[in-house]
């Protein structure tokens, strides 16, 4: 048994890395192997993550923390039985990738423009918590052409636009997703879509 | 210059309680209190994290000692609770710019433990 590709992993900068690698053959992940990690931290303790199947080859494992600081390292030993597969380390504030923005919402009722909101995925207290920016992505269920993404640069989870800049009478899709400057994350994942029907009263044409 | 200013250790019966700090001129990522016993190698006793969630503590005082820190002030502290004659030692604050806590020492406070 050998590792093919060796674990790579990514932070959400507060709870949960997520580390994958794919092994030489098919391979029950849960039952044949473990990933033990550990803090480089004196007095810390080793703690041993049971990965899941991500393939026939493809193993996946969701490493536990407490919270992150950017000076964390982590020794990971990839162990099947009693055989060392592979060592390595981790620097969680490396290799961030945000946490998904939750609860999507559009807000019609406000005379011809539509508001958008979301939430931050991260508490105050959170380094990541005012370093957010976001991309809204917004589409027609009808014209896959009418395709479009606003950068949110400021860091209030919201995005005004006129109603009237999307086609009328016909419904949308819109979703959204965050990434931080500071840390030069990858971008979150998609937060699930939300939808909704565009109508706006055209203004009476001056002859 | 950093400076790390420790107090709180005196003499205590058994089964007693003291609270020691340790005020650091600085934030460091690693805040940790060490002791050392006659005739015995320093030792770790218990350490913690910058942001003061994650704590960490030798086997021997497990659930009698409690680390905090107080980032603010850049104050570490340990509570002792329970205490028994083997953890009589001078008390050493360290604190470190990594995980190995040990980049700058305090002057160390005495702690008897005695009836």
């Known amino acids: 048994m050998k590792v093919l590709q060796e674990p790579t992993c990514v932070s959400d900068y507060m709870s949960i890395s997520t580390c994958e690698w794919k092994m030489n053959g098919p391979t029950n992940c849960s039952t044949e192997l473990r990933l033990l990690y550990q803090l480089v931290f004196l007095l810390s303790e080793a703690h041993t993550c049971i990965p899941e199947n991500n393939g026939g080859a493809g193993c996946v494992c969701h490493l536990l923390m407490d919270d992150v600081v950017s000076a964390d390292n982590y020794t990971l030993d990839l162990w099947a039985g009693q055989q060392l597969l592979w060592k390595g380390s981790f620097k969680p504030s490396e290799h961030v990738k945000p946490r998904a923005p939750g609860n999507l919402t559009v807000h019609t009722n406000v005379s011809d423009t539509l508001l958008l909101t979301w939430s931050n995925p991260y508490p105050p207290d959170n380094y990541l918590y005012n370093h957010l920016t976001y991309a809204v992505n917004i589409w027609s269920e009808n014209d896959p052409a009418d395709f479009r993404i606003y950068n949110v640069t400021y860091l209030e989870p919201s995005l005004r636009i006129a109603a009237s800049t999307l086609k009328s009478g016909i419904s949308y899709r819109a979703r959204v997703r965050a990434w931080a400057q500071c840390y030069n994350t990858t971008w979150s994942e998609w937060s699930p879509s939300t939808k909704w029907h565009n109508s706006y009263r055209e203004p009476f044409e001056q002859h | 210059q950093v400076q790390l200013v420790e107090s709180g250790g005196g003499l205590v019966q058994p089964g007693g309680s003291l609270r020691l700090s340790c005020a650091a001129s600085?934030?460091?990522?690693?805040m940790a209190w060490f002791r050392q016993a006659p005739g015995k190698e320093r030792e770790a006793v218990a350490t913690?994290?910058?942001?003061?969630?994650?704590?960490y503590y030798a086997d021997s005082v497990k659930g009698r000692f409690t680390i905090s820190r107080d980032n603010s002030k850049n104050t570490v502290y340990l509570q002792m609770n329970s205490l028994k004659a083997e953890d009589t030692a001078v008390y050493y604050c360290?604190?470190?710019?990594?995980?190995?806590?040990?980049?700058?020492w305090g002057q160390g406070t005495l702690v008897t433990v005695s009836s």
């Open positions: 600085g934030d460091f990522y690693c």
């Open positions: 360290a604190v470190g710019v990594d995980g190995n806590c040990r980049n700058y």
């Open positions: 913690i994290r910058s942001g003061g969630r994650s704590t």
